[in-house]
């Protein structure tokens, strides 16, 4: 295999036109890659809005916080951050808005301290199932990741593979059970139509889950039962029509939970009765007084908390012989 090596230079805020002495030796502690800014004191490297097309191979070994935002990376291959010596201190990696369309298996291997990863605002048409686990073993070595930010990673319609985008993302989250220690997961703004039923049960350490601004219609098959540590659940700006008894009971049973349900098109018919009753009693829903009906037309903009059972009726279902086309 080929391997990246390091270019050593004496400036800490790089100038692209300064020649740097390239060597096959380990990087010098004060080096800074071209087009990046480095602070050894803050253990931070920022390569921001520089149209980089690759991850620099000459990253300083001291880096703890790496910002590679606003670039044109396109692809993260296996071992994209593997270095000799390894980037053993790297704890926070932000790759948002860098036009990534492919993240390959093992892209984040050899980062033993990586706790926060942000891949938001990249059109990830091809996210390997083993992007985070690094191997295709049924049980992988645990990932150190605690926070995974995947907001707005849905590619344009014409760039999607012939498969479920939700399924692709969930496969990467569940592979090898590597993310058992994950505490924060953000999946906002991804056009999710559904949440595969396995996903939450296999992320038992979650404290914060953001599913806002998706297209979720129902949570009927989603179980929150195992998420005993869950503190916040963001479901704003989805397409939820009603929450059914099973979901309500599970949410109520979570000891630390706060749920956010604003801006969903609640259907205020007879199926809403249990949810309205629950809303009136529960303390877990933040801003519950802002929740309003969207349908049927006669109920539009009515506040859920102000409804009573008499308001929540369903039109009778006509026998087939009386139905009109």
């Amino acid at each position: 295999s080929s391997s990246p090596t390091s270019s050593a230079s004496s400036f800490s805020s790089s100038a692209p036109f300064l020649a740097s002495a390239v060597s096959a030796q380990p990087p010098l502690p004060d080096q800074c890659p071209a087009l990046c800014e480095c602070s050894e004191a803050a253990r931070t490297v920022k390569c921001v809005n520089r149209n980089l097309t690759e991850v620099p191979t000459d990253l300083p070994a001291y880096v703890r916080n790496l910002f590679l935002t606003g670039n044109q990376l396109a692809v993260l291959p296996a071992g994209a951050f593997a270095r000799r010596p390894p980037l053993a201190e790297l704890a926070a990696l932000n790759l948002s808005g860098s036009r990534l369309d492919e993240v390959r298996a093992g892209a984040f291997e050899h980062l033993p301290s990586l706790r926060q990863l942000d891949l938001s605002h990249n059109p990830l048409a091809d996210l390997s199932p083993f992007a985070f686990s690094g191997s295709n073993a049924s049980v992988s070595a645990p990932s150190p990741l605690v926070e995974l930010i995947l907001n707005h990673i849905v590619p344009p319609e014409d760039e999607r593979q012939n498969r479920s985008f939700e399924g692709m993302v969930v496969a990467a989250l569940l592979a090898g059970r590597a993310l058992q220690g994950l505490r924060r997961l953000e999946l906002a703004s991804n056009h999710f139509l559904y949440l595969p039923r396995d996903v939450l049960a296999q992320l038992p350490s979650l404290r914060h889950l953001d599913l806002s601004n998706n297209s979720l219609v129902s949570l009927t098959y989603v179980s929150f039962r195992n998420l005993t540590h869950l503190e916040s659940l963001h479901l704003e700006d989805n397409a939820l029509k009603v929450l059914h008894n099973g979901t309500l009971a599970e949410l109520q049973g979570l000891p630390h939970i706060r749920v956010f349900l604003d801006n969903n098109p609640w259907v205020c018919d007879c199926h809403m009765a249990d949810m309205v009753t629950w809303l009136k009693e529960t303390e877990v829903v933040q801003g519950k007084d802002r929740l309003t009906c969207a349908y049927p037309e006669k109920m539009r903009n009515r506040v859920l908390l102000e409804l009573n059972s008499a308001d929540l009726d369903c039109d009778p279902i006509l026998p087939p012989s009386l139905q009109t086309s």
């Epitope: 270019s7 097309t53 690759e54 692809v75």
Partner: antibody, heavy 121, light 107 residues
Framework: EVQLVESGGGLVQPGGSLRLSCAAS????????MNWVRQAPGKGLEWVSY????????YYADSVKGRFTISRDNAKNSLYLQMNSLRDEDTAVYYC??????????????WGRGTLVTVSS | DIQMTQSPSSLSASVGDRVTITCRAS??????LNWFQQKPGKAPNLLIY???ILQSGVPSRFSGSGSGTDFTLTISSLQPEDFATYYC?????????FGGGTKVEIK
């Protein structure tokens, strides 16, 4: 004219050193990544090394890692390959080749004519 | 490393023949496969990149196809100037690797 011209090849003893140069002209050298590719006599092509446009991303083939060093000087429109601890198996014609914006998903769309390196005692 | 295997290693053909050269990767390389032509004593010349895109100035009798692990270079009607050695090369991952070459000779 758009071209690449290699120089610096020659006969060298095992364990010796050579520095190859590649002079670029007719295009904006600083906008392109560059590569060295070699071809042993009567054999196929072997990629040797890659450097991106701003010298912050560099890759080597395992066969030369730790012995060869790629570098460039955009002000001089020049690419270099410093070859140390040369071995018999390094005998080859060395080509410089222009790449795209990254090592992956790219292709060599412009080649020099090559310079012959012979390692022999 | 990804191994690239070309077949055949050599072939004899006549002017006007349709010639097909195959290249197989040891693992998937998506569509990141390039083809080069090399004549004796000369540098290689890019023919096709990303499986099927014809490099500017290359005659349309050359075409490429395939995806994943199996790829093909086709010369629809062999011309006298096409007698040469052809190499495939993957740019899916480093190290970049070439096939062993296919020598097209005059029958």
């Amino acid at each position: 004219e758009v071209q690449l011209v290699e120089s610096g090849g020659g006969l060298v003893q095992p364990g010796g050193s050579l520095r190859l140069s590649c002079a670029a002209s007719g295009f904006t050298f600083s906008s392109y990544s560059m590569n060295w590719v070699r071809q042993a006599p009567g054999k196929g092509l072997e990629w040797v090394s890659y450097i991106n446009s701003v010298s912050n991303t560099i890759y080597y083939a395992d066969s030369v890692k730790g012995r060869f060093t790629i570098s460039r000087d955009n002000a001089k429109n020049s690419l270099y390959l410093q070859m140390n601890s040369l071995r018999d198996e390094d005998t080859a014609v060395y080509y410089c080749a222009r790449g795209g914006v990254r090592v992956l998903r790219s292709y060599f769309d412009l080649w020099g004519r090559g310079t012959l390196v012979t390692v022999s005692s | 490393d990804i191994q690239m295997t070309q077949s055949p290693s050599s072939l004899s053909a006549s002017v006007g023949d349709r010639v097909t050269i195959t290249c197989r990767a040891s693992q998937t390389i998506s569509s990141y496969l390039n083809w080069f032509q090399q004549k004796p004593g000369k540098a290689p010349n890019l023919l096709i990149y990303t499986t099927s895109i014809l490099q500017s100035g290359v005659p349309s009798r050359f075409s490429g196809s395939g995806s994943g692990t199996d790829f093909t270079l086709t010369i629809s009607s062999l011309q006298p100037e096409d007698f040469a050695t052809y190499y495939c090369q993957q740019s899916y991952s480093t190290p970049l690797t070439f096939g062993g070459g296919t020598k097209v000779e005059i029958k």
